[in-house]
């Protein structure tokens, strides 16, 4: 069964600045990643960022950098000030849209306990939603 | 209701310019590429530019370096500069709404460019 | 770029009959891939998305099928308002490729 996993990371120097990583582990041919804030895609989440293999990227402030990690992972550096500024229990949530498996999404979030910089091993999250 | 009304059709002679319009409304249209579409009447369709959210701008080889796509957010409003126009460029353009990656869902209703002289 | 085949370019049909469309990709687009109805005079309408999805408000006689490079558009049984020109519409590359168009006519 497919799976996606997601880390949430604050950088030390910034501690505005988050980095979000999110990965497919599955066979099929990833053709849509999506990233949102403040929970599902479609479900009362914010997209910050959408990444097409051929069409390129999308992305919305705070979104500074998102980028193709692998064939089948990302990466998206998020900075801000004020409203727009994530914190440290934000839910960052990755949908995958992979052929033909169809739509995988996994949330997560800030490790409660990590020091600035520092991360929980990007294991699997829990999968919230299969289409 | 989503809606996206183009405007700014018209006749122009060969080499003349014109500008389109399109008004949108009814969703957030920040968070969506725009496209133009047109159709040369009783013809196919055939895309002519794509614009994201933040700019980015895509050509058919055919209208590159004479049209230019452009976009107003704060106003919900889509454009395209049309310089250097030929007779092949009469058709019946349309504004078209899509969710980046997901296709084109909404379109507008046209508006009808004729080059002639 | 990629090139959509589409076939028939025409065909007639009485209400009640089934009809396929198909349209044929130069080049893997996996389903990015959606399927338009146009009536004379007026802007065309997606039926279907990511090659097999229905779009919302769109009677369930219609369905797409296939991925890669084979597409095909179904009407189970067709009704007197589906007589109209039916397009396909790859958007996985840039330039956006649209197929030639097939229209339905009355037998």
């Known amino acids: 069964t497919p799976e996606v996993w997601v880390q949430v990371r604050m950088e030390a120097t910034e501690l505005s600045s988050f980095t979000i990583r999110c990965g497919f582990l599955g066979s099929g041919s990833i053709s849509l990643v999506t990233v949102s804030w403040g929970g599902p895609n479609g479900a009362g989440g914010t997209t910050l960022a959408v990444l097409h293999p051929e069409r390129g990227i999308r992305q919305w402030a705070p979104a500074r950098q998102a980028r193709w990690e692998t064939q089948s992972s990302i990466s998206l550096i998020l900075e801000g000030s004020g409203a727009s500024s994530p914190c440290a229990n934000t839910t960052f949530c990755c949908k995958f849209a992979s052929f033909p498996e169809g739509s995988w999404e996994a949330c997560g979030s800030l490790p409660p306990s990590s020091d600035p910089g520092l991360s929980a091993p990007p294991t699997p999250a829990p999968i919230l939603r299969a289409d | 209701e989503v809606q996206l009304v183009e405007s700014g059709g018209g006749l122009v002679q060969p080499g003349g310019s014109l500008r389109l319009s399109c008004a949108a409304s009814g969703f957030t249209f920040r968070n969506y590429d725009m496209h133009w579409v047109r159709q040369v009447p009783g013809k196919g369709l055939e895309w002519v530019s794509d614009?994201?959210?933040?700019?980015?701008?895509y050509y058919l080889g055919s209208v590159k370096g004479r049209f230019t796509i452009s976009r107003e957010n704060a106003k919900n409003s889509l454009y395209l500069q049309m310089n250097s126009l030929r007779a092949g460029d009469t058709a019946v353009y349309y504004c078209?709404?899509?969710?980046f990656g997901n296709g084109m869902d909404v379109w507008g209703q046209g508006t009808t460019v004729t080059v002639s002289s | 770029d990629i090139q959509m085949t589409q076939s028939p370019s025409s065909l007639s049909a009485s209400v009640g009959d089934r009809v396929t469309i198909t349209c044929r990709a130069s080049?893997?687009?996996?389903?990015?891939l959606g399927w338009y109805q146009q009536k004379p005079g007026k802007a065309p309408k997606r039926l279907i998305y990511a090659a097999s999805s229905l779009q919302s408000g769109v009677p369930s006689r219609f369905s797409g099928s296939g991925s890669g490079t084979e597409f095909t558009l179904t009407i189970s049984s067709l009704q007197p308002e589906d007589f109209a020109t039916y397009y396909c519409l790859q958007h996985n590359n840039y330039p956006l490729t649209f197929g030639g168009g097939t229209k339905v006519e009355i037998k």
């Open positions: 614009i994201g959210n933040s700019g980015e701008t």
């Open positions: 078209v709404r899509e969710e």
């Open positions: 080049q893997g687009i996996r389903n990015d």
